[in-house]
Amino acid sequence: VPQKPKVSLNPPWNRIFKGENVTLTCNGNNFFEVSSTKWFHNGSLSEETNSSLNIVNAKFEDSGEYKCQHQQVNESEPVYLEVFSDWLLLQASAEVVMEGQPLFLRCHGWRNWDVYKVIYYKDGEALKYWYENHNISITNATVEDSGTYYCTGKVWQLDYESEPLNITVIKAPREKYWLQ
């Protein structure tokens, strides 16, 4: 049975600033045919037929649901892209994470400007402070890592706070063992 394709993002963030670039790639096994990919944005068929969809100089209208389809194979699960205009943007490698999977958070400055005196918060409590900006890396997410995250920091010596972001860690499905 052919696998459903999967949409991946490069860079891996699904929340980006207006004006930034992101490439969506439709991954699946044995999809070697050229010009055989269908892309759907908010349900509408895109003109792009390559396995990668490049969003250059992102606009607010680029926000929304993206799905891809190879040949007559099922559509991929949707990926949601959100385009922001702000000073700070908290980005996550995923907003719904399977328990045991890694989770990365990034406090991203508009125009890629340096952000410093960065504090990451979870459910209103400070998690981590760095003078220079660093990503937060959770190697094995647990259900306790679920919560509302945001970051604060300085850009051009002025204080800013990102919009909050809800992260949900879900329990991995149990393997089913059948008695022989």
Partner: antibody, heavy 121, light 110 residues
Amino acid sequence: EVQLVQSGAEVKKPGSSVKVSCKASGGTFSSYAISWVRQAPGQGLEWMGRIIPILGIANYAQKFQGRVTITADKSTSTAYMELSSLRSEDTAVYYCARVNPFGYYYAMDVWGQGTTVTVSS
Amino acid sequence: QSVLTQPPSASGTPGQTVSISCSGSSSNIGTNIVNWYQQLPGTAPKLLIYRNDQRPSGVPDRFSGSKSGTSGSLAISGLQSEDEADYYCAAWDDSLNGGIFGGGTKLTVL
């Protein structure tokens, strides 16, 4: 490579104003900021203020507040520093410098050649 | 009077190591980074060290910076005659909401 080229030397009377320009060439102008720094004869460096052209935001050292105006013209990649009510103590070399927010954490990484302003009656 | 305090002069012989200190307070160096600038005679200043200890490309590794608490330090090893210059530390001051410089240190290579 980015270069900052400043306007020529000026001789001014006390009480008058001077406007010094700083033109950036060979790089992006508006994503950076321009600071102005002065150096009186035989003295150290003194930060006057800065402008972030893309935001149109300028801020000034308290000492010069109300007497200095820093502006920028994005279309010509030029920053300006105007100092009013000049007095003899304003005789100095005035430098513009690019403030780098890309990994330099707002250090001034490129400097203009300096503009000598002499205030004399 | 400068907000950041540097010794007015320093000296050394070729090959030696010299250090220049820069003392500030909790509102500047204590909470922000230190940058160092070199000004050769008759020229514009040049960025020498940024982010406390980083060298821009083209700056020899003989120059190194460090920060501890409310003080910064610039070390120059293997001193050369062309290092004779004025050296300035700089930081952002949160109380003043502005940039500040040290008074400068004149380095003489004997």
